[in-house]
Structures are given as structure tokens and as C-alpha cells.
């Protein structure tokens, strides 16, 4: 129903705390360079204004759209052009073009320092002094670094953060209580960020239809007992929620997500038997829980998929009658039978089925043509299964760090023109798939591996779009989202690449490396590894292993030496010479 004042409506629905959090996230995602204090001031002004509209919906400006209200606030910021350059030009436009313009200026890789966690005592002190401000800082810092983070989910992570601090700051050993717990939240939040970015990419590049197909597959896997009409309703609602969040309409998004959670909990009988524990939780936890609820038990009596989609004489007639509905039912029926497949694979199969019908239904004898379609799925299914087996075997053999290095070598050979920091970030993220997925039961590995890899490769594509340097990467990123991962996997050494000349300074290290945290040490070593591959793209695994072992030994020796600086300055050049010889 239409409301006289949209802002009053959302304030009433969401409540002050969530309203303020979402407005802060929205501003932080649009203007990523502003300080927390600048944004907090705007949030307070917007909240005060919302309250006046709640008191009197007919008050001045209360009838304006949220985009107009928020856009006017952002455009009133002093020194906008000095700080944000051409983003200031957005302010010359009218809605809805102004909001579109803001969206186009979101930066997936803002030049902000890494979000450093203060040490435990300091963190607990500022948390106890002002929990609201502390959590505000968290929302601001995460949102500005991840401009497409799923806003209601970020509120959930802030709530988690809050609970951990409340618990751990009361402990004697705050550090050992906080570190593992906050590391866990950080890891989950980073995965949530790349997954949501993938959804927004799907929406932006291929539209709502593509996202809805993704949602149908995912929901059908999770809720195999729900009928097609129910799955379609859930997919439509979920598409609306994600469209709103990806479009910067965070208040509407969070409100509609809460509505969807409410609907699911009121209709458990027709959706799934596994929802009750989620539905017993408060709002943010409930919605989060529903988003990752375990798959319901598959019905025992499902007929073979071939009956309706291959053997039925009506296939082409049904396809002609309503193409999207027929393909939707195929995707639903196939997905509910295959919780062990990735969504990407299911969408590739649906695409193959569609292409087969397009071709075969135009022939004089369609059944003879499409009769073998299910057999033609086999290579499409085998390819990711082999990928999972090969990579999980390698992960089990090498461990996470060694697995990351193997991926780094592979991807540097595929796209040596890509900047070393991007390659290292990508390889480290891709390498985490081992820890995340390879330890799962067999039937959960494939969906975990492939859908995670697809999300990470989406980030590679986004970063590459900013500064395209590799034809290989451009080729894989230009195709459909579901074909990206197979495309990257199929890439081989880029034969067009002219190797980098050997620069001694690239491989020169100093004693400061010894005091770095383990993660930073790894990144330094991985940076050197990528540079080695750029120098010798066709170096063998043995050659690279020799060099990296030598390098690790050198670091170990010099970091244990009494005079570290002397060790680095004398042994460093020897290491460089040995590296050159080993790779000659």
C-alpha cells in the first residue's frame, strides 16, 4: 500500500536502532572516504527528520522519496568535489538518474588502509564507554570497504560483534577470548561480502531474470518438498529484496527481508520441516539462520526427471506455451533432486536444456533430437566433479598455504599481466576453498567449492574491469556468470606474455619481515612467488619449489640471527643469485 511518508513508514517498521544502522551503512557505501563523524552527523539529521515525519506525515518534505532525501543530504556535504572528484557531478542530476550515478561510482577496491583491529584492552575500553558509537564505527568501516555488503546481514554481524565483546570483555584473558571469535566473524563476513557482490553483479549485468533463476535453483535445493508455486513466490520475493539492497535501497531491502522471514515462518508446513529453530530466533538471527538453513529431506517418491522433460510427447508444446515457466519447472525439478550440485552447475544444465529445446523443437522430429539431452549433461557434471577431486586432493597434500601457492602459480601463468597484489589476494581467497569445503561430506563439496570459487572469480573480474590488462581475463569475465569458473579453469599459460625482466630489488628483503604477523609474512613470500612466475612463466613446479624452499630457509636463518640486518644484507644477494641460477 502507498504511504504518505516513505521515511516515516520505514522508521516505524524498522525501529530506531535498525533505521540508524541502515542509514549509516547506506551513506558509508555511497561516500566511502568520509569519516565516521561526518556520516554519524548526517545519520542523526536524517533520524531527527524521520521522527518529525512520524509525528506528522504531512510535515514539509516528508512526502519525498528516500532517494531524494538521502541524495540531497549527500550532495550537501562540503568539499564534495575536492574529496570525490566526478562523483560530485551526480548532484547535478535529478532522481532516479542521480542515484544511478552514485551507484556507478561505488568503488569495489577503495584505497583505504586495511581495517586493523585494536588490541583487546583498548577495544573493550571503547566498547564499554560507548557501545553504540563502537558498533557505529564497525558498520562504517565495513560498509565503506564493502560497498555492496548485504545491509541487513551487516546488522547481524554487528550484533554478533556486540555479543562477543559483551562476553569477552568480562573475561580475565580478553585477548584469547576475543581473537578466535572475532576472526570467525570476520571470515564469515568476508565470505558473505563476496557472495553478495556476486548477486549484485548478476542483477546488474544480466538482470532480474538471471538472479531469479539462481534463486529458484538454490531454494529448490533447500526446500525440495515445497511445490513450484511456493518456490516461485519465494524466488520472486528474494529477488526483490536483493534488487533493493544492490540498488542502495537499504531500508526497503531490510524491511522486505523481515517480511520474507515472517512469511516463511508462518508457512513452514508448505516450505520445509527444518525452519522451526530459525523461526524461534529474534529478527536478525532468524533471517540469517533462514538464509543458510540445512536442506530439507528430499521426497522419496520423486519420478525420474526424464518423464516430464524428455519422454513426454508434449515437451515442445509445453515449451512453446510458456518458455520461462517450463524452463523454471525444469530447473526446479532438477535442483530439488540435486542438493549435491552447485547452483552454477544447475544453471549450466538448464541453459543446455534450453539450447537443446531451441534447436530440437524447430526440427521435424523433436523427440528424436532431444531424446539424448540428459546423457549430454554428463560432461558438464563430470568437469566440476573432477575439479573438486583434483583440488581437494592437492589441498590435503599441501595444506592451505601450500595450496594457495599452487593456485598462485597457476593463475599467474594464466594471467601474468594482472597486478601482483590482485593475483595474491585472489590466490589466497581461492586457496581458502580447501579449508572451507574440502573437509565437508562428499555430497556437500561440489556446491561449496564451485559456488565459492565463482564468487571469488567475480571479484577478480570486478577488479580487472577497472584496469583491463589481460585478454584471458577479459574473455572469461565477458561471458555469462555461470561459465566464468569453467572458463578460468580451462585457461592455460598465456603464450602472448613477454616475461618480466629480473629485478633484484623485487627479491630483496629486510629484517622488518621478521616481526610481521604470520599472515603478512605469507603475503610477502607469495608476492615474491608471483614475481618469480612473471619472470619465468614456464618454470617447472620443481624449480619454483627449490627457490621457495631456499627463500624460506633464508628467512628462517636470518630471522634467528643475532645480527639480523647484517644477515639480510649479506645473505640476500646470495639468495638472489641462487634464484637466478635455479630458474636459468
Amino acid at each position: 500500500e502507498a504511504h504518505k511518508s516513505e521515511i516515516a513508514h520505514r522508521y516505524n517498521d524498522l525501529g530506531e536502532q535498525h533505521f540508524k544502522g541502515l542509514v549509516l551503512i547506506a551513506f558509508s557505501q555511497y561516500l566511502q572516504k568520509c569519516s565516521y563523524d561526518e556520516h554519524a552527523k548526517l545519520v542523526q539529521e536524517v533520524t531527527d527528520f524521520a521522527k518529525t515525519c512520524v509525528a506528522d506525515e504531512s510535515a514539509a518534505n516528508c512526502d519525498k522519496s528516500l532517494h531524494t532525501l538521502f541524495g540531497d543530504k549527500l550532495c550537501a556535504i562540503p568539499n564534495l568535489r575536492e574529496n570525490y572528484g566526478e562523483l560530485a557531478d551526480c548532484c547535478t542530476k535529478q532522481e532516479p538518474e542521480r542515484n544511478e550515478c552514485f551507484l556507478q561510482h561505488k568503488d569495489d577496491n577503495p584505497s583505504l588502509p586495511p581495517f586493523e583491529r585494536p588490541e583487546a584492552e583498548a577495544m573493550c575500553t571503547s566498547f564499554k564507554e560507548n557501545p553504540t558509537t563502537f558498533m557505529g564505527h564497525y558498520l562504517h568501516e565495513v560498509a565503506r570497504r564493502h560497498p555492496y555488503f548485504y545491509a541487513p546481514e551487516l546488522l547481524y554481524y554487528a550484533e554478533q560483534y556486540n555479543e562477543i565483546l559483551t562476553q569477552c570483555c568480562a573475561e580475565a584473558d580478553k585477548e584469547s577470548c576475543l581473537t578466535p571469535k572475532l576472526d570467525g566473524v570476520k571470515e564469515k563476513a568476508l565470505v558473505s561480502s563476496v557472495r553478495q557482490r556476486m548477486k549484485c553483479s548478476s542483477m546488474q549485468k544480466f538482470g532480474e531474470r538471471a538472479f531469479k533463476a539462481w534463486a529458484v535453483a538454490r531454494l529448490s535445493q533447500t526446500f525440495p518438498n515445497a511445490d513450484f508455486a511456493e518456490i516461485t513466490k519465494l524466488a520472486t520475493d528474494l529477488t526483490k529484496v536483493n534488487k533493493e539492497c544492490c540498488h542502495g535501497d537499504l531500508l526497503e531491502c531490510a524491511d522486505d527481508r523481515a517480511e520474507l522471514a515472517k512469511y516463511m515462518c508462518e508457512n513452514q508446513a508448505t516450505i520445509s520441516s527444518k525452519l522451526q529453530t530459525c523461526c524461534d530466533k529474534p529478527l536478525l538471527k532468524k533471517a540469517h539462520c533462514l538464509s543458510e538453513v540445512e536442506h530439507d529431506t528430499m521426497p522419496a517418491d520423486l519420478p525420474a526427471i526424464a518423464a516430464d522433460f524428455v519422454e513426454d510427447q508434449e515437451v515442445c508444446k509445453n515449451y512453446a506455451e510458456a518458455k520461462d515457466v517450463f524452463l523454471g519447472t525444469f530447473l526446479y525439478e532438477y535442483s530439488r533432486r540435486h542438493p549435491d550440485y552447485s547452483v552454477s552447475l544447475l544453471l549450466r544444465l538448464a541453459k543446455k536444456y534450453e539450447a537443446t529445446l531451441e534447436k530440437c523443437c524447430a526440427e521435424a522430429n523433436p523427440p528424436a533430437c532431444y531424446g539424448t539431452v540428459l546423457a549430454e549433461f554428463q560432461p558438464l557434471v563430470e568437469e566440476p566433479k573432477n575439479l573438486v577431486k583434483t583440488n581437494c586432493d592437492l589441498y590435503e597434500k599441501l595444506g592451505e598455504y601450500g595450496f594457495q601457492n599452487a593456485i598462485l602459480v597457476r593463475y599467474t601463468q594464466k594471467a601474468p599481466q594482472v597486478s601482483t597484489p590482485t593475483l595474491v589476494e585472489a590466490a589466497r581467497n581461492l586457496g581458502r576453498v580447501g579449508t572451507k569445503c574440502c573437509t565437508l561430506p562428499e555430497d556437500q563439496r561440489l556446491p561449496c567449492v564451485e559456488d565459492y570459487l565463482s564468487a571469488i572469480l567475480n571479484r577478480v573480474c570486478l577488479l580487472h574491469e577497472k584496469t583491463p590488462v589481460s585478454e584471458h581475463v577479459t574473455k572469461c569475465c565477458s561471458g555469462s556468470l555461470v561459465e566464468r569458473r569453467p572458463c578460468f579453469s580451462a585457461l592455460t599459460v598465456d603464450e602472448t606474455y613477454v616475461p618480466k625482466e629480473f629485478k633484484a630489488e623485487t627479491f630483496t628483503f629486510h629484517s622488518d619481515i621478521c616481526t610481521l604477523p604470520e599472515k603478512e609474512k605469507q603475503i610477502k613470500k607469495q608476492t615474491a612467488l608471483a614475481e618469480l612466475v612473471k619472470h619465468k612463466p614456464k618454470a617447472t613446479a620443481e624449480q619454483l619449489k627449490t627457490v621457495m624452499d631456499d627463500f624460506a630457509q633464508f628467512l628462517d636463518t636470518c630471522c634467528k640471527a643475532a645480527d639480523k640486518d647484517t644477515c639480510f644484507s649479506t645473505e640476500g644477494p646470495n639468495l638472489v643469485t641462487r634464484c637466478k641460477d635455479a630458474l636459468a
Epitope: Q313, E314, V315, C316, K317, Y319, A320, E321, E358, C360, C361, A362, E363, A364, N365, P366, P367
Partner: nanobody
Framework: KVQLLESGGGLVQPGGSLRLSCAAS????????MSWVRQAPGKGLEWVSS????????LYADSVKGRFTISRDNSKNTLYLQMNSLRPEDTAVYYC????????SSQGTLVTVSS
Amino acid sequence: KVQLLESGGGLVQPGGSLRLSCAASGFTFHSFGMSWVRQAPGKGLEWVSSISGSGSDTLYADSVKGRFTISRDNSKNTLYLQMNSLRPEDTAVYYCTIGGSLSRSSQGTLVTVSS
């Protein structure tokens, strides 16, 4: 909504000719192969002939081969069946169908071959 409307049937003497038409709407006609099927009184559905979307490929049941010709005009979204040398056993209700379907989703047109 898919609609198929057959016309052109009637009473004809053995050895005579008829041309059946099927006007199609509600789908991308040129993208789909089309067929003619028939149902004689008291019998089941029998496939008669099929044609590809482009019109380049045609198939016929042995019982009509050399006597019937299937064709289409994609600009008019219309399917045809030219029936020559008609026999009493060709008496049936004729239906046009999409892509090899052996079901009646339209009214059909009655062809009676009798002296």
C-alpha cells in the same frame, strides 16, 4: 496463450484432394517444428506428418507418403497439409500440433472421404 485453429476439412470423394490449414498464434511459430496428427472414428491418435521450423525438413507416415505434402508459411504463421489421392481410410479428424506432440489441444477439422 498458444492457439491452433484448423480449417479446410470437408466431404470429398475417393481420389479427390483437400488442403488443410492451421493458423497458429501465441508462440514464435518459426522456432517450432509442427505436425499433423489424425484420429479416425473409434481409433487412437495417429501421426501423419511433420515439418521443421524453417520448412526445410519433412517427415511422413508410410500410409500417406507420396500422397500428402506438408508445408508452412512462417510469414503468415500458418501450417498446411495438401492431401491428394484421398482414400476412405483417410477419414478422420485432423489436428495440427507443436513439435511432435501426439495430443489434441485444438478443435481439429473433419475430413470425410466417401463416395
